[in-house]
Interface confidence: low
């Protein structure tokens, strides 16, 4: 790496993957192992993220970009840049301090994450329960028996499943 020649700030010419080394007359030095600089002109390199424990490496650190982690099977990412891993549960369960527990009667969870939520109260909408709820599925509401005239069949379908990776927060 040749010495930078900028008259204003000699460090501004140091590219990503290097740092401006004050100890060596502001020469652009390569980032040491396990560190990176993603932009030019930096006076230090940042320490690479380490994916350990329940985290596993999705993308190795390079001299110009940080490592990226995801979660080991059975866990899912939470937070910006997968800053946290949370344990998966089965549908019909929610995560508690002591692990996955079945949803209580009257609640359900149709995902591997998130909390158990109460079944829809059909009567609030003046409807009746057409299909009973389970730990994994909400009830299906339909017209109340009085509304069912011959030939009519207006059933409210269950809410569409949420996209994977989106849980109610």
């Amino acid at each position: 790496f040749e010495r930078t020649r900028s008259l204003q700030d000699p460090c501004s010419n140091c590219p990503a993957g290097t740092f401006c080394d004050n100890n060596r007359n502001q020469i652009c030095s390569p980032c040491p192992p396990n560190s990176f600089s993603s932009a030019g002109g930096q006076r230090t390199c940042d320490i690479c993220r380490q994916c350990k424990g329940v985290f596993r490496t999705r993308k190795e650190c390079s001299s110009t970009s940080n490592a990226e982690c995801d979660c080991t099977p059975g866990f899912h990412c939470l937070g910006a840049g997968c800053s946290m891993c949370e344990q998966d549960c089965k549908q019909g369960q929610e995560l508690t301090k002591k692990g996955c527990k079945d949803c209580c009667f009257g609640t359900f969870n149709d995902q591997k994450r998130g909390i158990c939520r109460p079944w829809t109260n059909c009567s609030l909408d003046g409807k009746s329960v057409l299909v009973n709820g389970t730990k994994e599925r909400d009830v299906v509401c339909g017209p109340s028996p009085a509304d069912l005239s011959p030939g009519a069949s207006s059933v409210t379908p269950p809410a569409p499943a949420r996209e994977p990776g989106h849980s109610p927060q």
Partner: nanobody, 122 residues
Framework: EVQLVESGGGLVKPGGSLRLSCAVS????????MSWFRQAPGKGLEWVSH????????DYADSVKGRFTISRDNARDSLYLQMNSLRAEDTAVYYC???????????????WGQGTLVTVSS
Amino acid sequence: EVQLVESGGGLVKPGGSLRLSCAVSGFTFSDYYMSWFRQAPGKGLEWVSHISGSGTTIDYADSVKGRFTISRDNARDSLYLQMNSLRAEDTAVYYCAREDIRMPGTTDFDHWGQGTLVTVSS
């Protein structure tokens, strides 16, 4: 930078004892619940125990209750797991983890150590 470093693992005979340590740095240790997890060969991660920041709230998985004791020394930024009456099924890599309580009913373990291997075998 948050760091957690476990030590104290090793080979021990059934019925024996080990004390695991987890030295932490990079955050105010006493502000956080801490947990021990373990992962047996070919199995999933299992929560073992946790302790509140002040050490007043402690809980254990049923599988270790009465045999394992969790403790912490906030002055030394250290977490411990005393394991007695060890069994073959306790063989696992043991991890300490920092708990981040984000909302009621949701606990995320946002920082982990590298793990220490405990082998219980005659």
